[in-house]
């Protein structure tokens, strides 16, 4: 598993460094999660040919994975810090059920999958501290999430592999879009 943020070699080499700011902590946390996703994607791509598959759209229709759009205020055109922050937090909360699905989907990277899930929870907490308008954040309904999880786990093997691949790919993209927007704030 990657070294948790704040414990990398750069920090050791620079003991005089000021404590991390809120923005730096968020930035490091996202990069840490992206490291984890990278490791999980390696296992997924080695295990099956999903990463080269052209049948992605087929499976993608059944998933409602969060995606950044221009209306969310995270793009340069129409950038709105508060709207964007709400979108990032809401999106991460929506991803949590899919990250739960990823648990038990990996053999050699089981710890890594757990680390990605837990690190995302921490990231959400960091971002909630940064957000002013917490009332605008809608938390997914636990009952809906539970039935979605059951439905995903009941899929055949091919669809489960494809779902895993799509979740990782979409989560990576969402985090990258978030990282880019947060650096503009």
């Amino acid at each position: 598993a990657p070294v948790p943020p704040g414990e990398d070699s750069k920090d050791v080499a620079a003991p005089h460094r000021q404590p991390l700011t809120s923005s730096e902590r968020i930035d490091k946390q996202i990069r840490y999660i992206l490291d984890g996703i990278s490791a999980l994607r390696k296992e997924t791509c080695n295990k099956s040919n999903m990463c080269e598959s052209s049948k992605e759209a087929l499976a993608e229709n059944n998933l409602n994975l969060p995606k950044m759009a221009e209306k969310d205020g995270c793009f340069q055109s129409g950038f709105n810090e508060e709207t964007c922050l709400v979108k990032i937090i809401t999106g991460l909360l929506e991803f949590e059920v899919y990250l739960e699905y990823l648990q038990n989907r990996f053999e050699s990277s089981e710890e890594q999958a757990r680390a990605v899930q837990m690190s995302t929870k921490v990231l959400i907490q960091f971002l909630q501290k940064k957000a002013k308008n917490l009332d605008a954040i809608t938390t997914p309904d636990p009952t809906t999430n539970a039935s979605l999880l059951t439905k995903l786990q009941a899929q055949n093997q091919w669809l489960q592999d494809m779902t895993t691949h799509l979740i990782l790919r979409s989560f990576k993209e969402f985090l990258q879009s978030s990282l880019r927007a947060l650096r503009q704030m």
């Epitope: 930035d27 990278s38 340069q76 990576k172 990258q176 879009s177 990282l179 880019r180 650096r183």
Partner: antibody, heavy 119, light 106 residues
Framework: QVTLKESGPTLVKPTQTLTLTCSFS??????????VGWVRQPPGKALEWLAF???????YYSPSLESRLTITKDTSKNQVVLTMTNMDPVDTATYYC??????????????WGQGTLVT | DIQMTQSPSSLSAFVGDGVTMTCWAS??????LNWYHQRPGEAPELLVF???NLQIGVPSRFRGSGSETYFTLTINSLQPEDSGTYFC?????????FGGGTKLEI
């Protein structure tokens, strides 16, 4: 192998619009984390960043030139186009297109075109 | 906008020597800094990304370090092909900005 190549006029009259095309191969501009930017360099001077377009069509422009610049992409053709209106003799420079592609968005241009001199 | 300042603007050294050039950012950019090398008549080439990571294929005699507002690029055991201009780049946020460059003569 990743390659980029700029094309467009070498000579532009004052007040005219410059249209530059960056044709690339070896990567896709629909892959997350990938972007293409334009950078120019007047003779004997430093590099100046102009514009950038991401895989998801998010676009960024140099604030001092924003009103004159437009960047677009055609993913199917593997091309990025930069237009610059109201050209002036001070815009004489070598114009480069370059790729940025890494998981952590370090905004580093790892591959550059050969550049095209616009006078 | 984040301003990038490079020092010195030019320097001269012999083959085998070691040199260090510096780059300052007008505000903290964490480790989001890239270094490029440009030979006359050629396109720039990425040397170092994220302050200290060597780009694939770049010789280990190059070393980038620093964080927040102060960064350095050190070249040990200079080779004739190292001549040219070195640019640092703010890679933290848009607008991306380059330093004025350090011209190295071997």
């Amino acid at each position: 192998q990743v390659t980029l190549k700029e094309s467009g006029p070498t000579l532009v009259k004052p007040t005219q619009t410059l249209t530059l095309t960056c044709s690339f191969s070896g990567f896709s501009l629909s892959t997350s984390g990938v972007g293409v930017g334009w950078v120019r360099q007047p003779p004997g001077k430093a590099l100046e960043w102009l514009a950038f377009i991401w895989w998801d069509d998010d676009k960024y422009y140099s604030p001092s030139l924003e009103s004159r610049l437009t960047i677009t992409k055609d993913t199917s053709k593997n091309q990025v186009v930069l237009t610059m209106t109201n050209m002036d003799p001070v815009d004489t420079a070598t114009y480069y297109c370059a790729r940025s592609a890494d998981d952590y968005l370090y905004y580093s241009f790892d591959t550059w075109g050969q550049g095209t001199l616009v006078t | 906008d984040i301003q990038m300042t490079q020092s010195p603007s030019s320097l001269s050294a012999f083959v085998g020597d070691g040199v260090t050039m510096t780059c300052w950012a007008s505000q903290s950019i964490n480790d989001y800094l890239n270094w490029y090398h440009q030979r006359p008549g050629e396109a720039p080439e990425l040397l170092v990304f994220a302050a200290s990571n060597l780009q694939i294929g770049v010789p280990s005699r190059f070393r980038g370090s620093g964080s927040e507002t102060y960064f350095t690029l050190t070249i040990n055991s200079l080779q004739p092909e190292d001549s040219g201009t070195y640019f640092c780049q703010n890679a933290h946020s848009f607008p991306l900005t380059f330093g004025g460059g350090t011209k190295l003569e071997i």
